[in-house]
Interface confidence: low
């Protein structure tokens, strides 16, 4: 019994003055609580509690179920307890068969004894099966048997509490251990699609899959930078004991532009959290954006190839694509394909392959694309670089020598005089007149240049060279002169091509 210090409240005293009391079934239990400030007796066993406001607790005919802890409390909140065992050979165990254990924690098999003097209080497997080798337990006659550090492998384990009575093993009712797994990793979360592009009024629906060891994983859809509660629907499945799957589906039945944003599926358990996001973009109507992959002004040499390439974004999907030149539509020589096979792809590529281009094939090449909402186009200006061609070279009636050349870029015409029989014409002659003429062909075609010199300046036999050149190449034409007396005669001109 507790000792009393004067002036300080003391706990009540109980008669009989021992911590444990053993009585036989059918005997009387008589417990007396002595305290000037007595408040109540409390009886506890398993989940049962009873109270008594009398300072003497009397049970005339004790039963096994009267086994338990009797506590007397005074007005200062101080208490004292006695534990009573009611020995009943026919009922050695009091039992609460609910048995849940959290993985890695201890759990109590609740089978307190009615007789503390039996021996070998332990656990046994059902139907004679051995317990798992690593199962450790600590028996306590007043509480039951504590299983230490519950393992996931113990789930659905069937067991009995057991004692030896008069040389025989006596088993309690059976217990089935249900293990609640510990979270040893963050939940696994995935989303049906990483991004969505919709037009106003279309339905937005996205599903998040959450996987974990048990259904106590928490999950929610959140909108980034918003506290608004989102409407979600759940489906869930248990694939075996520790393999739980939940699908959380978020739906906006008629999406609006201001619904655009990032939506996060967040899940957490006691180990940690995980999240995955999906992006929603809602547009008021469809769109097409075209991006040229090469310069829209293209220079290509005569006889060479060029590829005109565009990338374009189209939403909804493109329905018509075409390449046009001089009001004619290409039926071949081009291809159009999606940039990726991803179902949410909106980016496409179109390529027009122009081969062995001629000087007459320069011009505007146009790509047109349309979907159900919009049309779009882009034009490429193609210039074909051609070596100069001398169209005419004549001696005019006024004594002028005239050379007309065509090519692209615009040719330059230089004049040279070669006296006598010299092969190389190096003395340059300044032209009297140079004009760029309008070509009768299409724009982007060859440019025509006319240059003239005065032949009266030549006093000796020789050759006059008209040389036309540009970045691509050069071409020459020659005028031969011979003097008979005082008369100058033109011998037929001829051309010499110089690449």
């Amino acid at each position: 019994q507790p000792s009393v210090s004067p002036g300080e409240p003391s706990p009540p005293s109980i008669h009989p003055g021992k911590s444990d009391l053993i009585v036989r079934v059918g005997d009387e239990i008589r417990l007396l609580c002595t305290d000037p400030g007595f408040v109540k007796w409390t009886f506890e066993i398993l989940d049962e509690t009873n109270e008594n406001k009398q300072n003497e607790w009397i049970t005339e005919k004790a039963e096994a179920t009267n086994t338990g802890k009797y506590t007397c409390t005074n007005k200062h909140g101080l208490s004292n307890s006695i534990y009573v065992f009611v020995r009943d050979p026919a009922k050695l165990f009091l039992v609460d068969r609910s048995l849940y254990g959290k993985e890695d924690n201890d759990t109590l098999v609740r089978c307190p004894l009615t007789d503390p003097e039996v021996t070998n209080y332990s656990l046994k497997g059902c139907q004679g099966k051995p317990l798992p080798k690593d199962l450790r337990f600590i028996p306590d006659p007043k509480a039951g048997i504590m299983i230490k550090s519950v393992k996931r492998a113990y789930h659905r384990l069937c067991l009995h509490c057991s004692v030896d009575q008069e040389g025989k093993s006596v088993l309690s009712e059976k217990f089935i251990l249900k293990v609640r797994p510990a979270f040893k990793a963050v939940p696994v979360v995935s989303v049906s699609k990483a991004s969505y592009l919709l037009r106003e009024g279309e339905e937005f629906t996205v599903t998040c899959t959450i996987k974990d060891v048990s259904s106590s994983v928490y999950s929610t859809w959140k909108r980034e930078n918003s506290q608004t509660k989102l409407q979600e629907k759940y489906n869930s499945w248990h694939h075996g004991d520790f393999n739980y799957e939940r699908q959380a589906t978020l739906t906006i039945s008629s999406a609006r532009v201001n619904d655009s944003g990032v939506f996060m599926c967040y899940a957490n358990n006691t180990f940690g959290s995980a999240n995955v996001t999906t992006t929603l973009e809602v547009v008021d109507k469809g769109f097409i954006n075209i991006f040229p992959m090469i310069n829209t002004t293209v220079f290509v040499n005569d006889g060479e190839n060029v590829d005109l390439i565009v990338e374009y974004e189209a939403f909804p999907k493109p329905e018509h694509q075409q390449w046009i030149y001089m009001n004619r539509t290409f039926t071949d020589k081009w291809e159009d394909y999606p940039k990726s096979e991803n179902e949410s792809n909106i980016r496409y590529v179109s390529e027009l392959h122009l081969t062995r281009l001629k000087g007459t094939e320069g011009g505007t090449y146009t790509f047109l694309v349309s979907n159900s909402d919009v049309n779009a186009a882009i034009a490429f200006n193609v210039y074909v670089n051609t070596k100069p061609e001398i169209l005419t070279y004549d001696r005019l009636v006024n004594g002028m020598l005239q050379c007309v050349a065509a090519g692209f870029p615009e040719p330059t015409i230089d004049w040279y005089f070669c006296p006598g029989t010299e092969q190389r014409c190096s003395a340059s002659v300044l032209p009297v007149d140079v004009q760029t003429l309008n070509s009768s062909g299409p724009p982007f075609g060859k440019l025509v240049v006319q240059s003239s010199i005065d032949s009266s300046a030549f006093k000796h036999n020789g050759t006059v060279e008209c040389k036309a050149y540009n970045d691509v190449g050069k071409t020459s034409a020659y005028f031969n002169f011979a003097f008979k007396g005082n008369n100058k005669e033109q011998i037929h001109p001829h051309t010499l091509f110089t690449p």
Epitope: D104, S149, K184, V186, N268, F271, G272
Partner: antibody
């Protein structure tokens, strides 16, 4: 009673090695993150390293990376810190600490050992 | 890395005083801040976690507040056993401690 007891400290020359141990009792050691935190003489606390419950992930203070290795043996309820290439600035009391969590992957140290002293001096 | 700065580094106070210690993070750490108490020759002891949650067994005169980068530990009425050094610690990215605040008897 939940308890952490460190051992293995001592005097070592610069460039030398030491292995610290921490024995855990009174709790399910295999279910907790564990850490080493040190305190140089007259200075504040400095987190050194930690390890997740199965031992598959480790994190280190930049200045000890490549020199220190944290490990654990769940069967023996033990945490270790292997310290190589020791420097004078590693002189400190080394505490073993248990990491507990609140909510998500946010940790605090709720149980500490009494510490073991490491002195690096020539 | 996230740096933690505590102020003041030391203060003198009397029993019964209200004491406030501040801790500033070099970048936002949400509410991921803990406070520890350490007495000479002893291991640190967790007082408060997640900015304001009192660890089991810690007297209610200790309280914490703040969020983002600025945090405060308050002792509403200083008791003789509260004279010690106090450390803040962030748990947002890896782990780092403040330099400590020593609370001495005036």
């Amino acid at each position: 009673e939940v308890q952490l007891v460190e051992s293995g400290g001592g005097l070592v020359q610069p460039g030398g090695s030491l292995r610290l141990s921490c024995a855990a009792s009174g709790f399910a050691f295999s279910g907790y993150y564990m850490a080493w935190v040190r305190q140089a003489p007259g200075k504040g606390l400095e987190w050194v390293a930690n390890i997740n419950y199965p031992g598959s992930s480790t994190y280190y203070l930049d200045s000890v990376k490549g020199r220190f290795t944290i490990s654990r043996d769940n069967a023996k309820n033990s945490l270790y810190l292997q310290m190589n290439s020791l420097r004078a600035e590693d002189t400190a009391v080394y505490y073993c600490a248990r990491g507990d969590y609140y909510g998500t992957t946010y940790w605090y140290f709720d149980v500490w050992g009494q510490g073991t002293t490491v002195t690096v001096s020539s | 890395d996230i740096q933690m700065t505590q102020s003041p580094s030391s203060l003198s106070a009397s029993v019964g005083d209200r004491v406030t210690i501040t801790c500033r993070a070099s970048q936002s750490i949400s509410s991921y801040l803990n406070w520890y108490q350490q007495k000479p020759g002893k291991a640190p002891k967790l007082l408060i976690y997640y900015t304001s949650r009192l660890q089991s067994g810690v007297p209610s005169r200790f309280s914490g507040s703040g969020s983002g980068t600025d945090f405060t530990l308050t002792i509403s009425s200083l008791q003789p056993e509260d004279f010690a050094t106090y450390y803040c610690q962030q748990g947002r990215r890896l782990w780092s401690f403040g330099g400590g605040t020593k609370v001495e008897i005036k």
